[in-house]
C-alpha cells in the first residue's frame, strides 16, 4: 500500500494501483544541502550525484565516534523522500548533494553561504534546466543567509526550506524567514501540526505552506535496502521540493512567483487544526497542505492570488507595517488588521517603483498588520486613485475613471484616532462596481488595473448586528483580489483574504459594551481573466483543471 | 516572510573619526552595521562574514580583505581570510578577534558584518 504521505499529496486521479504519476521531475535538478549521503542506496542509486563540496564544522565532544551510517542518515532519508524509487515524490528527478552538515547534523551559516555560492557558480558554468535547492536546515535569523537566498532566487533558482522544528515563529529563523524562499511547515497523517518531543513545527507568516512531516518512510543509511521513518520540517520541505520538481518538469518556464502561487493554489485548504498554534499566530499561519496538481497541463487560465502578511508594526503611535509582493507579482489590494481594533487603516503607496501596502497604528493600539493581496497578472498596468477625506456629510468615494481599468481593491486610511465616534455612518451607494466608498473622514484608495481580458465584480455580505466575523467568498472560476470592510468603524478589527474568502473581523461586542446597531459588511472584489483562459485553451484545447479542482475549495474561517 | 531586519539582535556601531587615519571613512551618511545571532548558544564568535556593498568587484573584495589583515597586523592581531565571496554576495569570511570589529566596520565598501552562527538539520 502507498505510504500515507504520498497518498496525501497525490490527487485522486493518480491513485490507481500504485503511485506512479506522469513525469517524475526528470527535467529538473534538485540540489540538497545537508549531511553526507549514502548515494548507492537501492532507493536512490544513480539519482544523486555527490559533489565534491564539503564545508562542515568539527563534531562536538571528545568522545564522538564517527559512524558512517549516522553521518549519512539525515541526507539519505531526504534524498529518498525527494526522488526515491519507491517512496519518493519526484521519482524522475536527479539530485546533487553538498555536505554542509556534519555527523551531528550541525553546520554553519558561512558553510551554507559558500554552498549556495557553489551552486550559483555551477549554474553559470553549466546552465541546465530548472533548479530546485533544498535547504533542510535552520539557524537563528541571519541577514546574510537571507540575502544570499534572495540573490540565488533572483537568478532563477527555486529554494525550498524547512520552517524549523522549534514550535516557534518561523520568522525568527533562517533561511525560513527569507521572503524569496518557499518555507514549509510539517503536518501529520491527521493533517495536524507535527509535535516533535516538547517542540514541533514552526508556524507564522513566514511559512508558505505545510506538507507531510511525521512518520515519513524513506531510505535508511543503516543498510543499502533499509527504510526508516523520520519526522521533521526537513521531511516536509523535501515533499515540496519533489512537488516543485514535478511542476517544473511539466512547465519548465515557470517563474518562482508562478510556482509559489501554484503550490498554494493546489494545496488542500483549511484542513489543519489551528488550535495547535498560539492564538496570536493563527490568523498569520497559512492553513494549506501541499499537493500535486490534478493535471500535468498548465493552469495558465487561472488568475492566481495569495495573501502576504507584514511583520507586526509594534505599538508606538506612528508605527506602520509594510507588506510587499514578490517582484513579478502585482499588488491588487491592501487591507489591515489590529487585534485591539485601534488602527488608522491602510494605503497602497509606491516604494522603489513598486506598490506596497502600508498599515497605520493608532494611539493606544497594540500594533497593526498590513495585508497585501499579491497576484499574477501578466501585462498589467495598475495604479492607485486616491480621494482625500470628504468635506460633505456623505462618505468619501473614488472610482476607476480610466478607460479599460477595473477596480481590484479598496483601502482607506484616516488620521483621526477613532472613526467610530464620528457620525454619520457610511451608506454604500449601490450599482457602482468600479467605485470605493468610505467614511467621510478617511482618504480612500482604489487599486485600478488594466490587463487583457480582466473583469471584476463586487460581492458583499452584511450582517445587521456586529458579529465577530463576517465572510464573503468568490464563486468558482473567480479569484478574490480585494477584501475590505464597510464601514471602517472602531469595532472592526480589520479585513483579510483567506484563499478565496474575504474575512472581516470585529471586536467581541460583549466586551466592548457597544450598542451600535450598525451593520458590518464584508466587501469582496472577485476577478477573472478571460485573456488567460483563452490563451490556455489555445495551448491545450481546453483545460481539465476546473472539475478536478473542486476538492481544493474548502473555505477557511478563523 | 521576513523582509526588514527586525526580530534579531543588531549592534550598530556608530563610527567616529577614522581611527589613526588608516581606514577610509565609509561613504557619507552610511554606517556599516554588525549583526549576530539572537540565540546565544548558536553564536560562533571569532568568525565573521564581511558583506560588501552590492556592486563591489572581486578585486575590491580581495583588496578590502588584505587591508583588514594589514591594519589588524599593525595592532598586533592575527587574522585569516577563510573565503572570498563572489557570484552571490560580495564579501569575505574572516577568522579574527572580535576586538577588530570596529576597525572592520570602517573599511571602505563594507555594508554590514555578521558573526557566524550554527545551523541545524531539521
Amino acid at each position: 500500500s502507498i505510504p500515507w504521505n504520498l497518498e496525501r499529496i497525490t490527487p485522486p486521479r493518480y491513485r490507481a494501483d500504485e503511485y506512479q504519476p506522469p513525469d517524475g521531475g526528470s527535467l529538473v535538478e534538485v540540489y540538497l544541502l545537508d549531511t553526507s549521503i549514502q548515494s548507492d542506496h537501492r532507493e536512490i542509486e544513480g539519482r544523486v550525484m555527490v559533489t565534491d563540496f564539503e564545508n562542515v564544522p568539527e563534531e562536538d565532544g571528545t568522545r564522538f565516534h564517527r559512524q558512517a551510517s549516522k553521518c549519512d542518515s539525515h541526507g539519505t532519508h531526504l534524498a529518498g523522500v525527494v526522488s526515491g524509487r519507491d517512496a519518493g515524490v519526484a521519482k524522475g528527478a536527479s539530485m546533487r548533494s553538498l555536505r554542509v552538515l556534519n555527523c551531528q547534523g550541525k553546520g554553519t551559516v558561512s558553510g551554507t553561504l559558500i554552498g549556495l555560492e557553489f551552486i550559483r557558480k555551477s549554474q553559470l558554468v553549466q546552465p541546465v534546466g530548472p533548479l530546485v535547492v533544498l535547504l533542510p536546515l535552520a539557524g537563528g535569523y541571519s541577514r546574510v543567509l537571507n540575502a544570499a537566498c534572495q540573490r540565488l532566487a533572483r537568478a532563477g533558482v527555486v529554494l525550498v526550506t524547512a520552517a524549523g522544528n522549534f514550535r516557534d515563529d518561523a520568522c525568527l529563523y533562517s533561511p525560513a524567514s527569507a521572503p524569496e524562499v518557499i518555507t514549509v511547515g510539517a503536518t501529520n497523517a491527521q493533517d495536524q501540526p507535527v509535535t516533535l518531543g516538547t517542540l514541533g513545527t514552526n508556524f507564522g507568516r513566514c511559512v508558505d505552506l505545510f506538507a507531510p512531516g511525521e512518520d515519513i518512510i524513506g531510505a535508511s543509511s543503516d543498510c543499502s535496502t533499509c527504510f526508516v521513518s523520520q519526522s521533521g520540517t526537513s521531511q516536509a520541505a523535501a515533499h515540496v521540493a519533489g512537488i516543485a520538481a514535478m511542476m517544473l518538469s511539466a512547465e519548465p518556464e515557470l517563474t518562482l512567483a508562478e510556482l509559489r502561487q501554484r503550490l498554494i493554489h493546489f494545496s488542500a485548504k483549511d484542513v489543519i487544526n489551528e488550535a495547535w498554534f498560539p492564538e496570536d499566530q493563527r490568523v498569520l499561519t497559512p492553513n494549506l497542505v501541499a499537493a500535486l496538481p490534478p493535471s500535468t497541463h498548465g493552469a495558465g487560465w487561472q488568475l492566481f492570488c495569495r495573501t502576504v502578511w507584514s511583520a507586526h508594526s509594534g505599538p508606538t503611535r506612528m508605527a506602520t507595517a509594510i507588506a510587499r509582493c514578490a517582484p513579478d507579482e502585482e499588488l491588487l489590494s491592501c487591507s489591515s488588521f489590529s487585534r485591539s481594533g485601534k488602527r488608522r487603516g491602510e494605503r497602497m503607496e509606491a516604494q522603489g517603483g513598486k506598490l506596497v501596502c502600508r498599515a497605520h497604528n493608532a494611539f493606544g493600539g497594540e500594533g497593526v498588520y498590513a495585508i497585501a493581496r499579491c497576484c499574477l497578472l501578466p501585462q498589467a498596468n495598475c495604479s492607485v486613485h486616491t480621494a482625500p477625506p470628504a468635506e460633505a456629510s456623505m462618505g468619501t468615494e473614488v472610482h476607476c475613471h480610466q478607460q479599460g481599468h477595473v477596480l481590484t481593491g479598496c483601502s482607506s486610511h484616516w488620521e483621526v484616532e477613532d472613526l467610530g465616534t464620528h457620525k454619520p455612518p457610511v451608506l454604500r451607494p449601490r450599482g457602482q462596481p468600479n467605485q470605493c466608498v468610505g467614511h467621510r473622514e478617511a482618504s480612500i484608495h482604489a487599486s485600478c488595473c488594466h490587463a487583457p481580458g480582466l473583469e471584476c465584480k463586487v460581492k458583499e455580505h452584511g450582517i445587521p448586528a456586529p458579529q465577530e466575523q463576517v465572510t464573503v467568498a468568490c464563486e468558482e472560476g473567480w479569484t478574490l483580489t480585494g477584501c475590505s470592510a464597510l464601514p471602517g468603524t472602531s469595532h472592526v478589527l480589520g479585513a483579510y483574504a483567506v484563499d478565496n474568502t474575504c474575512v472581516v473581523r470585529s471586536r467581541d461586542v460583549s466586551t466592548t459594551g457597544s450598542t451600535s446597531e450598525e451593520a458590518v459588511t464584508a466587501v469582496a472584489i472577485c476577478c477573472r481573466s478571460r485573456h488567460l483562459a483563452q490563451a490556455s485553451q489555445e495551448l491545450q484545447g481546453s483545460s481539465d483543471y476546473k472539475d478536478d479542482d473542486k476538492h481544493h475549495h474548502h473555505h477557511h474561517h478563523h | 516572510q521576513e523582509d526588514e531586519d527586525g526580530d534579531y539582535e543588531e549592534l550598530v556601531l556608530a563610527l567616529r573619526s577614522e581611527e589613526d587615519g588608516l581606514a577610509e571613512a565609509p561613504e557619507h551618511g552610511t554606517t556599516a552595521t554588525f549583526h549576530r545571532c539572537a540565540k546565544d548558544p548558536w553564536r560562533l564568535p571569532g568568525t565573521y562574514v564581511v558583506v560588501l556593498k552590492e556592486e563591489t568587484h572581486l578585486s575590491q573584495s580581495e583588496r578590502t580583505a588584505r587591508r583588514l589583515q594589514a591594519q589588524a597586523a599593525r595592532r598586533g592581531y592575527l587574522t585569516k581570510i577563510l573565503h572570498v565571496f563572489h557570484g552571490l554576495l560580495p564579501g569575505f569570511l574572516v577568522k579574527m578577534s572580535g576586538d577588530l570589529l570596529e576597525l572592520a566596520l570602517k573599511l571602505p565598501h563594507v555594508d554590514y558584518i555578521e558573526e557566524d552562527s550554527s545551523v541545524f538539520a531539521q
Epitope: R42, R85, T225 | -
Partner: antibody, heavy 115, light 110 residues
Framework: QVQLVQSGAEVKKPGASVKVSCKAS????????ISWVRQAPGQGLEWMGW????????NYAQKLQGRGTMTTDPSTSTAYMELRSLRSDDTAVYYC????????WGQGTTVTVSS | QSALTQPASVSGSPGQSITISCTGT?????????VSWYQQHPGKAPKLMIY???NRPSGVSNRFSGSKSGNTASLTISGLQAEDEADYYC?????????FGGGTKLTVLQ
C-alpha cells in the same frame, strides 16, 4: 562510456576458492554499488549479492551467506567476488552488473569447478 | 526466496505482438516499483530492456514496453522481429535482496 570489465576464465578444483574481479569505468563510482549474478549452464540468472564502492557495505543472498565475500577497492575502481569451498554446482558464468538496477553488465567470467 | 514465475516459452510470428508475464507476490513484484526485464542472447551477457516497471533505457526500441498490475508484471514486444529471439528474464526487488524469474525463451517463427 560506462564499462565493466571482468577477469578471465578460471578452472578450480572442488574445495578451492576463486576470486573474480570487475573493473568499473565511465561513471561516478560512489553512486552505484556492484551486483554479482551467476548463471549455471543452461539455467537462469541468480542474484548473489551486492557490494558498495562508497563504504564497502555488502548485501548477500541467503544462499551465499558464509561462503562468499564481496569487496571493493575504490583506488583501482575494482570490485571483487570471492567464493570459497567450491563445489561442482558452482560451475557457472559469473557476471558483475552496475548497482541494484543492473543496467550495465560485465562480459562474464566462466568458473569451472572440476576434479 | 523462490524465483518469480515466468512461462518457459512463448512464440510469435514476425510483426505480431507477444506478452511475457512475470508473477510474484506482494513482497516483491506487488510491493515495489522496481521490476526490470532483461534480454539475453546465447553466449552473451544480459541486456536491460525495461526498468522500474515501464521505463525504457535509451537505445532500446519502443517496440518493448512494460506494465504491472498487482503482483504480475508484463513485457510486451510489438512488431516482432527475428533479432528479438532470445531468453527474457524479469527481476524485482524484495525487502532485502533481488529475485529473478526463471526465464522465458522467445521463439520468432519463420
Amino acid at each position: 562510456q560506462v564499462q565493466l570489465v571482468q577477469s578471465g576464465a578460471e578452472v578450480k578444483k572442488p574445495g578451492a576458492s576463486v576470486k573474480v574481479s570487475c573493473k568499473a569505468s565511465g561513471y561516478t563510482l560512489t553512486s552505484y554499488g556492484i551486483s554479482w549474478v551467476r548463471q549455471a549452464p543452461g539455467q537462469g540468472l541468480e542474484w548473489m549479492g551486492w557490494v558498495s564502492f562508497y563504504n564497502g557495505n555488502t548485501n548477500y543472498a541467503q544462499k551465499l551467506q558464509g561462503r562468499g565475500t564481496m569487496t571493493t577497492d575504490p583506488s583501482t575502481s575494482t570490485a571483487y567476488m570471492e567464493l570459497r569451498s567450491l563445489r561442482s554446482d558452482d560451475t557457472a558464468v559469473y557476471y558483475c552488473a552496475r548497482g541494484y538496477g543492473m543496467d550495465v553488465w560485465g562480459q562474464g567470467t566462466t568458473v569451472t569447478v572440476s576434479s | 526466496q523462490s524465483a518469480l514465475t515466468q512461462p518457459a516459452s512463448v512464440s510469435g510470428s514476425p510483426g505480431q505482438s507477444i506478452t511475457i508475464s512475470c508473477t510474484g507476490t506482494s513482497s516483491d513484484v506487488g510491493g515495489y516499483n522496481s521490476v526490470s526485464w532483461y534480454q539475453q542472447h546465447p553466449g552473451k551477457a544480459p541486456k536491460l530492456m525495461i526498468y522500474e516497471v515501464s521505463n525504457r533505457p535509451s537505445g532500446v526500441s519502443n517496440r518493448f514496453s512494460g506494465s504491472k498490475s498487482g503482483n504480475t508484471a508484463s513485457l510486451t514486444i510489438s512488431g516482432l522481429q527475428a533479432e528479438d529471439e532470445a531468453d527474457y528474464y524479469c527481476n524485482s526487488y524484495t525487502s532485502t535482496s533481488m529475485v529473478f524469474g526463471g526465464g522465458t525463451k522467445l521463439t520468432v517463427l519463420q
